[in-house]
């Protein structure tokens, strides 16, 4: 005999599980339909009636097939140091990421919970490791023969210009000054810039403290409880 297609709700066979997009309702002891993303279970199934689903209300969402009694609340609006990279819809939560010049000091499941400004290396120090979405800039002292005269999160240490005749020798925070005769070799004018990190999705990385840097100010964002996972098995 050909196998019959069971319509929800139905009693699963011994040792079997419910099919894709179904869940086992422990109260009804039946396989029942899940609700699609953007919906939630308004009425749970019984032995004689399937799950009744309803759309999520404004500012709430479900991202997965589910049987949650209420949709999850979207996260709070992005703070001033963040940009909204994904809007709150019925099917997805709002995602906030750090704006340019900032990095994620404390990530959450999606997006960033706490942004902090990228460290600026003061004169005499250059960028050893550039900032990323999730890590701060690392500064290093300019080695002999190099300098940085800026307070910057992107400038590296540059070689001193080489003079035929040196008027003022260079140091870690100042280029060499040549006499009026042209130098034999010089760097192109202007600071050398590293590319800014582009903030998208972030992971948690502790910022590396550097004693030789300007202080970094952090702004704490409101932290609510993480939303419950949709899925598994419910009443």
């Amino acid at each position: 005999l050909p196998a019959q297609v069971a319509f929800t709700p139905y009693a699963p066979e011994p040792g079997s599980t419910c099919r894709l997009r179904e869940y086992y309702d422990q109260t009804a002891q039946m396989c029942c339909s899940k609700c699609s993303p953007g919906q939630h279970a308004k009425v749970f199934c019984t032995k004689t009636s399937d799950t009744v689903c309803d759309s999520c209300e404004d500012s709430t969402y479900t991202q997965l097939w589910n049987w949650v009694p209420e949709c999850l609340s979207c996260g709070s609006r992005c703070s001033s140091d963040q940009v909204e990279t994904q809007a709150c819809t019925r099917e997805q939560n709002r995602i906030c990421t750090c704006r340019p010049g900032w990095y994620c000091a404390l990530s959450k499941q999606e997006g960033c919970r706490l942004c902090a400004p990228l460290r600026k290396c003061r004169p005499g120090f250059g960028v050893a490791r550039p900032g990323t979405e999730t890590s701060d800039v690392v500064c290093k002292p300019c080695a002999p023969g190099t300098f940085s005269n800026t307070t910057s999160s992107t400038d590296i240490c540059r070689p001193h210009q080489i003079c035929n005749v040196v008027a003022i020798p260079g140091n870690a925070s100042m280029d060499a000054v040549c006499t009026s005769t042209s130098p034999t070799r010089s760097m192109a004018p202007g600071a050398v810039h590293l590319p800014q990190p582009v903030s998208t999705r972030s992971q948690h990385t502790q910022p590396t403290p550097e004693p030789s840097t300007a202080p970094s100010t952090s702004f704490l964002l409101p932290m609510g409880p993480s939303p419950p996972a949709e899925g598994s098995t419910g009443d």
Epitope: P9, T48, G234
Partner: antibody
Framework: QVQLVQSGSELKKPGASVKVSCKAS????????MSWVRQAPGQGLEWMGW????????HYAQGFTGRFVFSLDTSVSTAYLQISSLKAEDTAVYFC????????WGQGTLVTVSS | DIVLTQSPDSLAVSLGERATINCRAS??????????MHWYQQKPGQPPKLLIY???RLESGVPDRFSGSGSRTDFTLTISSLQAEDVAVYYC?????????FGGGTKVEIK
């Protein structure tokens, strides 16, 4: 395959407490509820109620409220039945049974209450 | 609560003969096209063993001499040709609504 393994026999004095365990294997523990069934010596089967293994919410049958407590440790896929203030009439074999309409059963735990 | 009344209380049948056990429910146990009536065999010192589920479906590994029939309130377990190892107590159980209830049991012996 589905297996429910219960703790061993217990001999208790009246007024004492007992905790029976039921360890599940061969399926996802939090998918199916767990029922408890009592069988007094020479008697039939009596359903005591069940616990939702996903939410942890217990549901007690009439006559099994108060002294009877269902609990879980999902980290070890185990359900528990605790009976307090034991009486001689609590002497019985206690079975755990997976709640899936028809039941898969543990081997049973004999609890004897005697002074 | 749904009351299940099993008959007879005990039954003595010759080896190779048919054994029939009845179970009557105080209200229907049918829903969604299924009969939520199940049959178990219990031997001394052992837990009940599922034989028939949802009225008439034979559990895997159970000999096909066992069969179940009926609907709504009246159900029957039949052993077509009794074997020595079938000596046991047989219970019906309903799961259409809580509380789960069991019949009082039927003891099957060899005549």
């Amino acid at each position: 395959q589905v297996q429910l393994v219960q703790s061993g026999s217990e001999l208790k004095k009246p007024g004492a407490s007992v905790k029976v365990s039921c360890k599940a294997s061969g399926y996802t523990f939090t998918t199916f509820g767990m029922s408890w069934v009592r069988q007094a010596p020479g008697q039939g089967l009596e359903w005591m109620g069940w616990i939702n293994t996903y939410s942890g919410v217990p549901h007690y049958a009439q006559g099994f409220t108060g002294r009877f407590v269902f609990s879980l440790d999902t980290s070890v896929s185990t359900a528990y039945l605790q009976i307090s203030s034991l009486k001689a009439e609590d002497t019985a074999v206690y079975f755990c049974a997976r709640r899936s309409n028809f039941a898969y059963w543990g081997q049973g735990t004999l609890v004897t209450v005697s002074s | 609560d749904i009351v299940l009344t099993q008959s007879p209380d005990s039954l003595a049948v010759s080896l190779g003969e048919r054994a029939t056990i009845n179970c009557r429910a105080s209200q229907t146990v049918d829903s969604s096209g299924n009969s939520f009536m199940h049959w178990y065999q219990q031997k001394p010192g052992q837990p009940p063993k599922l034989l028939i589920y949802l009225g008439n479906r034979l559990e895997s590994g159970v000999p096909d001499r066992f069969s179940g029939s009926g609907s709504r309130t009246d159900f029957t377990l039949t052993i077509s040709s009794l074997q020595a190892e079938d000596v046991a107590v047989y219970y019906c159980q309903q799961s259409n609504e809580d509380p789960w209830t069991f019949g009082g049991g039927t003891k099957v012996e060899i005549k």
